[in-house]
């Protein structure tokens, strides 16, 4: 069969039906990321709370992130939301402190449960906080007598009862 003449048009061009199906370059502010396209797509514009992370080219779309104080949400940074503090998560009512037993070490995302050291047979070396996960120490069996000058770690706790520095809560 006859080959489609448009299949010869590379990325960055489009098959121009108005000009005998010759390959025309994508106009400014548009792109085609694959060959054989009959139209070029309009470049994404990173405006308002969005910031240009990667400029649009004739073969690839622009990529956006967020202006200072905001961070991306959704595939391809479809939304920007305000940063919270470490130790918080964003809810419908604004930024809220992480509940006891959970932490968030970033300005975005949700609070996650502390690691349960006892599940790995380890003890808690450093208590968890709203901003930091617990640090698990070696299992009691790993500590041979006199082998360490470190104060022995606290015994493992039941899930949900890890020690926590609750100052300021």
């Amino acid at each position: 069969g006859l080959q489609d003449p448009c299949s010869n048009c590379p990325a960055g061009t489009f098959c121009d039906n108005n000009r005998n199906q010759i390959c025309s370059p994508c106009p400014p502010n548009s792109f085609s990321s694959a060959g054989g396209q009959r139209t070029c797509d309009i470049c994404r514009q990173c405006k308002g709370v969005f910031r240009t992370r990667k400029e649009c080219s004739s073969t690839s779309n622009a990529e956006c992130d967020c202006t200072p104080g905001f961070h991306c949400l959704g595939a391809g940074c479809s939304m920007c939301e305000q940063d919270c503090k470490q130790g918080q998560e964003l809810t419908k009512k604004g930024c809220k402190d992480c509940c006891f037993g959970t932490f968030n070490d970033q300005k975005r995302g949700i609070c996650r449960p502390w690691t349960n050291c006892s599940l790995d047979g380890k003890s808690v070396l450093v208590n968890g906080t709203k901003e930091r996960d617990v640090v698990c120490g070696p299992s009691p069996a790993d500590l041979s007598p006199g082998a360490s000058s470190v104060t022995p770690p606290a015994p493992a706790r039941e899930p949900g009862h890890s020690p926590q520095d609750i100052e300021g809560r």
Partner: antibody, heavy 118, light 107 residues
């Protein structure tokens, strides 16, 4: 309607700490950030820092070691503290709201003049 | 820090004139530029953000354009109440920085 009002002492001695309050109304503190900007007499605008709705702060590195911004949601108030002031800190100090659409200032207080002098 | 250089530093125009203020960023800031108007003895007022979007309530005679490093604020027909100093501001990265200002006088 949206309103912001700065208040605090108009005169501060060198080496002391400048403390200002911004009292706001007409918008929710859980949704909007607030910036502090200053303007020395006859000069341009300088951004000092911002406190976001969740309480996270970002400061101008040129002042970072001296500036602290905080808020008291229950009083609808924001505060600016600038330590170890000199005559170069004499300026009109403004607080301004950050909208949800960009990292800019859409509503400003009327400003308060702070003079640093002994 | 990103430097924002405004020109001219001052200009004089008659009522009805078309006036253009330019702002040049020391590095690419996309379209993350705002413009403010400050009337004598008053606080600044937002005019434009995202280089070209008018803030609510801003008269249509004010327009903004540009991207990358070069930006323009245009007043299509100057009015007596436009007597003010105009500032650009970049918000592409911290610290947020302002231009030095352009003082508009009315002849």
């Amino acid at each position: 309607q949206v309103q912001l009002q700065e208040s605090g002492p108009g005169l501060v001695k060198p080496s002391e700490t400048l403390s200002l309050t911004c009292t706001v109304s007409g918008f929710s503190l859980i949704s909007y950030g607030v910036h502090w900007v200053r303007q020395p007499p006859g000069k341009g605008l300088e951004w000092l820092g911002v406190i976001w709705s969740g309480g996270s702060t970002d400061y101008n590195p040129s002042l970072k070691s001296r500036v602290t911004i905080s808020k008291d949601t229950s009083k609808n108030q924001f505060s600016l503290k600038l330590s170890s002031v000199t005559a170069a800190d004499t300026a009109v100090y403004y607080c301004a709201r950050n909208p949800l659409t960009a990292t800019v200032m859409d509503y400003w207080g009327q400003g308060t003049l702070v003079t640093v002098s002994s | 820090d990103i430097q924002m250089t405004q020109s001219p530093s001052s200009l004089s125009a008659s009522v009805g004139d078309r006036v253009t203020v330019t702002c040049r960023a020391s590095q690419n800031v996309g379209t993350n530029v705002a413009w403010y108007q400050q009337k004598p003895g008053k606080a600044p007022k937002a005019l434009i953000y995202s280089a070209s979007y008018r803030d609510s309530g801003v008269p249509s005679r004010f327009s903004g354009s540009g991207s990358g490093t070069d930006f323009t604020l245009t007043i299509s027909s100057v009015q007596p109440e436009d007597l003010a100093t105009y500032y650009c501001q970049q918000y592409n990265s911290y610290p947020l920085t302002f231009g030095g200002g352009t003082k508009l006088e009315i002849k």
